[in-house]
């Protein structure tokens, strides 16, 4: 069954945590649907963003952080492992120095920590997708 | 009650027709939600677009056409009559020479016809909005 979009969930992250998302674009790639995943510092959507991951399907991925309300230096990738019309599985793993983003089991993007992952309090998944799975796994201590 | 988004409806347009849309952005303007309205030449979403109207709430509006699969010259406006967090009523009227876009009763944008409005067969409303009303009114002959 489908999860509501935008989908918001409280989360605590640290090295070893993984956020897993399963979904499908709502439109063909010609129409440039988007997927966005934001790791927020508060439960409020206006809060700062530790890791902003935005896919413009078929075109590009941009990653950034929003600090004290201001967007910082954008990182862009043309790597496009997503398939037109196909379900995707996205996993974002917290490594000691960066986030590693896997798409369908394939390492596709990395983003160096600018803000500690421990500052994350909420994850939001939204834009032009249907969402079937959202999970945060925590490293067993 | 809410209409599904993306929302797709068959439509025939000509001078005097008006498309009316009521909805609300799904996120605060700081997070740049989008609204998109596309007038297609076929019932298929991959078809050409006679009039493409995209709002990046709080930032800008872009208008364009997609002809033989290729985007043409984009028209951009910084006019932003939409209110953060507020419901909007959008009406797109077909004038003899252009589309006139009204936001909350106020004339806000125009777009000269590049393709005859009679070529329109489908209207799609989508991206980051909840949709409460969609109506196409036809001029009484």
């Amino acid at each position: 069954s489908l999860l509501p979009v935008p989908y918001t969930e409280a989360a605590s992250l640290s090295t070893g945590s993984t956020v897993t998302i399963k979904g499908r674009p709502l439109a063909c790639f010609l129409n440039e649907p988007y997927l966005q995943v934001d790791f927020h510092t508060e439960m409020k959507e206006e809060s700062d963003i530790v890791f902003h991951f935005q896919v413009c399907f078929g075109r590009r991925v941009v990653m950034n952080s929003r600090e004290y309300g201001a967007w910082k230096q954008q990182v862009e990738s043309k790597n496009m492992p997503f398939q037109d019309g196909q379900e995707f599985e996205l996993s974002i793993s917290v490594l000691p120095d960066k986030y590693q983003v896997m798409v369908n089991g394939q390492s596709s993007y990395t983003f160096d920590h600018r803000i500690k992952p421990e500052a994350v309090k909420m994850v939001q998944v939204w834009r032009d997708i249907s969402l079937t799975k959202f999970n945060v796994s925590y490293l067993k201590r | 009650s809410l209409l599904p988004v993306p929302y797709t409806e068959a439509a025939s347009l000509s001078t005097g027709s008006t498309v009316t849309i009521k909805g609300r952005p799904l996120a605060c303007f700081l997070n740049e939600p989008y609204l998109q309205v596309d007038f297609h030449t076929e019932m298929k979403e991959e078809s050409d677009i006679v009039f493409h109207f995209q709002v990046c709430f709080g930032r800008r509006v872009v208008m364009n056409s997609r002809e033989y699969g290729a985007w043409k010259q984009q028209v951009e406006s910084k006019n932003m009559p939409f209110q953060d967090g507020q419901e909007f009523e959008l009406s797109i009227s077909v004038l003899p020479d252009k589309y006139q876009v009204m936001v909350n009763g106020q004339s806000s944008y125009t777009f000269d016809h590049r393709i005859k409005p009679e070529a329109v067969k489908m209207v799609q409303v989508w991206r980051d909005i909840s949709l409460t009303k969609f109506n196409v009114s036809y001029l009484k002959r």
């Epitope: 910082k72 230096q73 990182v75 120095d97 160096d112 600018r114 500690k116 421990e118 500052a119 | -």
Partner: antibody
Framework: EVQLVESGGGLVQPGGSLRLSCAAS????????MSWVRQAPGKGLEWVSA????????SYVDSVKGRFTISRDNAKNTLYLQMDSLKPEDTAVYYC????????????????WGKGTLVTVSS | NFMLTQPSAVSVSLGQTARITCQGG??????ASWYQQKPGQAPVLVIY???GRPSGIPERFSGSSSGDTATLTISGAQAEDEADYYC??????????FGGGTHLTVL
Amino acid sequence: EVQLVESGGGLVQPGGSLRLSCAASGFTFSSYAMSWVRQAPGKGLEWVSAINSGGGWTSYVDSVKGRFTISRDNAKNTLYLQMDSLKPEDTAVYYCTKYSGPELNTQYGMDYWGKGTLVTVSS
Amino acid sequence: NFMLTQPSAVSVSLGQTARITCQGGNFGSYYASWYQQKPGQAPVLVIYRDSGRPSGIPERFSGSSSGDTATLTISGAQAEDEADYYCQSGSSSDNTVFGGGTHLTVL
């Protein structure tokens, strides 16, 4: 071996200008963010400005905004600091520093420093 | 204005443990780095990302952070550790600030 060699310091009158240079060697200059840090005589360190690896993103401490401009020439492996409208309080040793990544990102610190060049602003 | 506050001086007996604090930072969000500066020399990075140690830095140097305080610990201080120490952290990821510095004396 990583080397950062600053030049261009000297004595200048208040309101005057100087251009500092930092010649980099021993690493792929175009892959790393760089910055300028200064130290007034007998005082502590003060970060002044930084620039990302490609040169498209810059940042400044408030006290120099609008007066100093950081830039880089990746073909020449050189970092610059254009200092205009100089004030006596700009008097300091200016160090060129290398970040250990392409971004202005505080997580890694500044892993290499030059020996510094002295700027004196006095009438 | 964002400021990092360090004690101006800390003393430690040879072979004992020295702790230098850095207060006022948002260390829940931003990482701390520490630098050692000896007279007439350029600073040297001794700790990055709160607790990381660059190659060539002795194991007796360690770092930690919690809340608004970062701490540099020198376990078994040596005579050659006598120097000025500066903390550094972000007021955002692309803006950085240094603490006022701490002079460590090894007795």
